[in-house]
Interface confidence: low
């Protein structure tokens, strides 16, 4: 006769491992007992269990509650056992020793491999600001056995770097994603993808990029100079910018206080019916937590009773 087993049995951490050992004997042969032992223990073989044809299953105190026979129906020639709730420390060499009648003893070895699926974590880097050089956007760490694969899935242009730390029974892999922040990256997903033989599918953790920026400010409303004349109603100036975080707007007049009746409504400056008193230099101040910008315009209200033309100057400053 001969023993049928597997060279390697692979299970995921926490699963039950079936350690196969089947004696394929000739007609009339019987299995008296099957002994299972750890074959790689430092101080010789350590017994797990012994299946006896008459007295049943005996389990070593070190494995109490963890070693069982497979559920019925059972073949009397089958010496397989179940090792419940496999842990990393279970990984190693196991030996099955079968005592048969009348053929004698047989033994076989197998290796138990316990996969430890990673639990990845994604840590965002420092706050991203437009104008920075190459900056850490996020790092992703996954520890498992064997070492997991950590990659990135994103449409954002960047560079990755990985490092691995080996422990006694596992390995931790950290991958960093660096980029040069730009406003176009705002709201873009950056996904850490972790692959491992112990996972049914890749694990993905997504981080949404936030890049602080503030665009140049400009003022609209003076495009048609002929509209800025005494008596005109509904005249307004609008300050244009964009940013992350969204900016706030403030209007001032450089050459004095805002004339009475002029309304400030966020980015818009609304005028009452125009008079020559509304002529002056108006400044839009745009700011967010990242930066601030100014844009100033000169308003010259044309009095039809005067012959002088109207001049309009636009100046933008940061």
């Amino acid at each position: 006769g001969e023993l049928e087993t597997s060279d390697v049995v692979t299970v995921v951490l926490g699963q039950d491992a079936k350690l196969p050992c089947f004696y394929r004997g000739d007609s009339g042969e019987q299995v008296g007992q099957v002994a299972w032992a750890r074959a790689d223990a430092g101080e010789g073989a350590q017994e797990l269990a012994l299946l006896h044809s008459k007295y049943g299953l005996h389990v070593s105190p070190a494995y109490e509650g963890r070693v069982e026979q497979p559920p019925p129906p059972r073949n009397p020639l089958d010496g397989s056992v179940l090792l419940r709730n496999a842990v990393q420390a279970d990984e190693g060499e196991y030996e099955c020793r079968v005592s048969t009648f009348p053929a004698g003893s047989f033994q076989a070895r197998l290796r138990l491999r316990v996969l430890v699926p990673p639990l990845p974590s994604l840590n965002p880097g420092p706050a991203l600001e437009e104008g920075q050089g190459l900056t850490l956007a996020a790092s992703c760490t996954a520890e498992g056995s064997p070492a997991p694969s950590v990659t990135w899935d994103t449409e954002v242009k960047g560079t990755t770097s990985s490092r691995s730390f080996k422990h006694s029974r596992s390995a931790a892999v950290t991958s960093e994603f660096h980029l040069v922040p730009s406003r176009s990256m705002n709201g873009q997903p950056l996904t850490c993808v972790v692959s491992h033989p112990g996972l049914l599918q890749d694990q993905r953790i997504t981080h949404i990029l936030h890049v602080s920026f503030l665009a140049e400010a400009s003022v609209r409303g003076l495009e048609d100079q002929n509209l800025w004349h005494v008596g005109r109603e509904g005249a307004m100036l609008k300050c244009l910018s964009e940013g992350q975080p969204p900016p706030s707007y403030n209007w001032t007049r450089l050459d004095g206080p805002l004339p009475s009746g002029v309304r400030v409504d966020g980015d818009t400056l609304g005028f009452p019916p125009l008079t020559t008193e509304h002529s002056g230099i108006y400044v839009c101040h745009v700011s967010n937590e990242f930066s601030s910008r100014d844009s100033q315009v000169t308003v010259d209200v044309l009095d039809p009773q005067e012959d002088s033309g109207k001049q309009v100057d636009l100046v933008s400053a940061s």
């Epitope: 639990l119 990845p120 974590s121 994604l122 760490t141 520890e143 931790a172 996972l199 049914l200 599918q201 694990q203 993905r204 953790i205």
Partner: nanobody, 118 residues
Amino acid sequence: EVQLVESGGGLVQAGGSLRLSCAASRSTFSLNIMGWYRQAPGKQREYVATITTGGSTNYADSVRGRFTISRDNAEDTVYLQMNSLKPEDTAVYYCTAELVRRGPTTYWGRGTQVTVSS
């Protein structure tokens, strides 16, 4: 479904200390990352600190050196020790936990108020 319950918030003078706790209901799956965010009145929720099952930590620059995050994996509990508190630390502090099964799922607590008076 994982339930997160924060405690330990309150009123404290500037320079004082508080310790927040967040207990997660038991889950048959291990919680991957746990941590804290906060939201001050009129502001967006902001990251404070996180800790992995292995004990690796990360902090926002604004709290680094003053706040310490720790974790009891056996009890699925995360703590935030807050020292040298400033008025700008005033916010509702939210606990967060991520469960990794075949993909990550993030859970949030209801928050605990921390008020730092000057």
